[in-house]
Interface confidence: medium
């Protein structure tokens, strides 16, 4: 009277049937402390990069300035989530925060996803306008250019995230003590179109969210290394330190930008290929095991970058300082407005004030005097 | 071969206690959750209790709490049913099942419950004075 | 508790009809819902899970629809070996609870 049991799919998939899948172990408080961690560092440092933009004059203000802005306002209004999910996951996957605040705090991931890399690649192209183009685009890189090109940007990150919004629901599914923060396909799917739903959605976040941007950012990344080369070799040898140093910069951010979202996109790819390629079981949960770290490295990036793209130049070090130093009310005039003269705009790549080379604004206009000496992030 | 034997069952009083057991094979018996489900003579069936993998959560019908306890050791591939209290209307073939249940790439924590797809051939529990 | 109810409790048809069972839940279990089949003597069988999913190995005349609170169970095509007692099981909430079963027999 026995019954041998047919081996069924577990959920997404119709391949690995003969799998046998176990709850995921949370790592206790590791991912947690990860989170929380990113959460203090993401709101200090993206407060400070906000502070530092918007406590300039709007004439000292240069096009990726917004881009700057944009990117801490992303990363921050994504980080202030990251107490919610700390507690989800040290909860072991328990949700007590309510519907509206799942649908809210996983939209923010996604409109941070691809906020973040919208903006990267906003200024990378705007960079790459000011060193391989100048003359050409100086029009193109106008205030009101990179105002719109930000608000573009915006409407996109926001559109695209919305599917997470709809979808995110909360729920005890076969679980009557905890309930979860999870994406309910029932409403535009059924059960046997659930995973086509996932996989569109997965490769078209992956298309849209990292590999066309990633593309575009290597793309300028790689005329502005053969353009600085270039002009590199018309320079006299004491320009080669300053040259490694630029170029180490951009190397940096765009194998941070890569290491980070990488392993997310890489193995949510790989385990979405597995229903074609059909991976041995320990293949398969080994990615499974391994995409909540993945994720954990993703969100890393949201207080990597003021890091990344503010801290490495010294006047936003001196608007730091300043502020640093006005909040224990030892800040005199005169330092005040010499640091804060310098560190007007800490995206804009000039130690000088608009001389003889500038256009409107203080744009550079002679491709000759690309400021490659200057030991600023984002050249102008 | 993917196999379930129960085995326990037997004639018991009013009152009294009997333990039942499911020895599994052909499968990784830690991985799976595991359920007992009844069948009174002529009547349908009835879901009793389960197990999780670690035997961290357990659930049972309200009818047997407190009466019942399942439990499992995985040193031995086996699943229990300590049945104490019973009662004539506990009357019944008692087979366990193996739960299968589905989990989400993406949202870790969720499950999808699958149904249960191993059965046992049942073990007879018989309550009479 | 969340009550199932099957209908019929129990049908008569011929081999090579089509054959619909329901199964109505007392409140919304969205598609939590599979159907098993149990010869006499023996263990049940699982034959769908998730309302609609099918179960490897199950004949593709066994079909089963619905979702919310009212499920279907179809046998398009009976066979011989079909002939047997169907049960609906919600894994909504728990307690899970079971329909009260519905007898297929030969006409």
């Known amino acids: 009277m026995e019954e041998g049991g047919d081996f069924d799919n577990y959920y997404g998939a119709d391949n690995q049937s003969e799998c046998e899948y176990t709850d995921w172990k949370s790592s206790g408080a590791l991912i947690p402390a990860i989170y929380m961690l990113v959460f203090l560092l993401g709101t200090t440092g993206n407060g400070l990069v906000l502070w530092t933009v918007f406590r300039s004059s709007r004439e000292k203000r240069r096009s990726a300035d917004i881009f700057i802005a944009s990117l801490a306002v992303a990363d921050l209004t994504f980080v202030v989530t990251l107490p919610l999910w700390a507690t989800y996951t040290y909860r072991d996957y328990d949700w007590p925060f309510g519907t509206f605040f799942c649908k809210l705090s996983s939209y923010l991931i996604f409109v941070n996803m691809y906020a973040s890399v919208f903006c990267l690649t906003g200024l990378s192209f705007d960079r790459y306008l000011a060193i391989v183009r100048p003359v050409a685009n100086a029009r193109l890189r106008l205030r009101v250019s990179g105002a719109v090109a930000t608000a573009v940007l915006w409407v996109l990150a926001a559109l695209l995230a919305m599917p997470v919004m709809v979808l995110r629901t909360t729920g005890d599914l076969e679980n009557t003590t905890k309930v979860q923060c999870y994406m309910d396909y029932s409403m535009v799917a059924t059960v046997s179109s659930e995973w086509a739903w996932e996989v569109g959605l997965g490769v078209s976040s992956t298309t849209v969210g990292f590999v066309v941007p990633f593309t575009i950012m290597l793309t300028c990344y790689f005329f502005i290394a053969q353009t600085i080369a270039g002009h590199f070799r018309k320079e006299r040898i004491e320009g080669l330190r300053k040259r490694r140093r630029l170029l180490s910069i951009i190397v940096v951010l765009v194998v941070t930008f890569a290491l980070c979202w990488m392993p997310y996109h890489l193995v949510k790819t790989l385990y979405m290929l597995g229903s074609l390629l059909h991976w041995p079981c320990d293949f398969d949960l080994f990615l499974m095991n391994i995409f909540p770290y993945c994720t954990c490295i993703s969100y890393v990036n949201s207080c990597l970058n003021p890091f990344l793209y503010a801290f490495f130049d010294p006047r936003f070090r001196q608007a730091c300082t300043s502020m640093l130093c006005c909040g224990q009310s030892r800040c005199a005039g005169t330092s005040h407005s010499s640091s804060g003269e310098k560190s007007a705009s800490y995206s804009s790549g000039h130690s000088q004030g608009p001389g003889p080379n500038m256009g409107k604004g203080g744009e550079q206009m002679h491709e000759k005097s690309i400021p490659y000496s200057q030991e600023t992030l984002v050249v102008d | 071969e993917v196999q379930l034997v129960e085995s326990g069952g037997g004639l018991v009083q009013p009152g009294g206690s009997l333990r039942l057991s499911c020895v599994a094979s052909?499968?990784?018996?830690?991985?799976?959750?595991m359920s007992w489900v009844r069948q009174a003579p002529g009547k349908g069936l009835e879901w009793v209790a389960n197990?999780?993998?670690?035997?961290?959560?357990?659930y049972y019908v309200d009818s047997v709490k407190g009466r019942f306890t399942i439990s499992r050791g995985d040193a031995k591939n086996s699943l229990y049913l300590q049945m104490k209290s019973l009662r004539a209307e506990d009357t019944a073939v008692y087979f366990c099942?193996?739960?299968?249940?589905?989990?989400?790439?993406?949202?870790?924590?969720?499950?999808?419950?699958?149904?249960?797809?191993?059965w046992g051939q049942g073990t007879t529990v018989t309550v009479s004075s | 508790d969340i009550q199932m109810t099957q209908s019929p409790s129990s049908l008569s048809a011929s081999v090579g009809d089509r054959v619909t069972i329901t199964c109505r839940a007392s409140?919304?279990?969205?598609?939590?819902l599979g159907w098993y089949q149990q010869r006499p003597g023996k263990a049940p069988k699982r034959l769908i899970y998730?309302?609609?999913s099918l179960q490897t190995g199950v004949p593709s005349r066994f079909s089963g629809s619905g979702s919310g609170t009212e499920f279907t169970l179809t046998i398009s095509g009976l066979q011989p070996e079909d002939f047997a007692t169907y049960y609906c099981?919600?894994?909504?909430?728990?307690?899970?609870?079971f329909g009260q079963g519905t007898k297929v027999e030969i006409r």
């Open positions: 409140q919304g279990i969205r598609n939590d």
């Open positions: 052909g499968f990784t018996f830690n991985n799976y959750w």
């Open positions: 099981l919600q894994h909504n909430s728990y307690p899970r609870t």
């Open positions: 998730a309302a609609s």
């Open positions: 197990i999780k993998q670690d035997g961290s959560e357990r």
């Open positions: 099942a193996r739960d299968r249940f589905g989990y989400s790439f993406y949202d870790k924590g969720v499950r999808y419950y699958y149904g249960m797809d191993v």
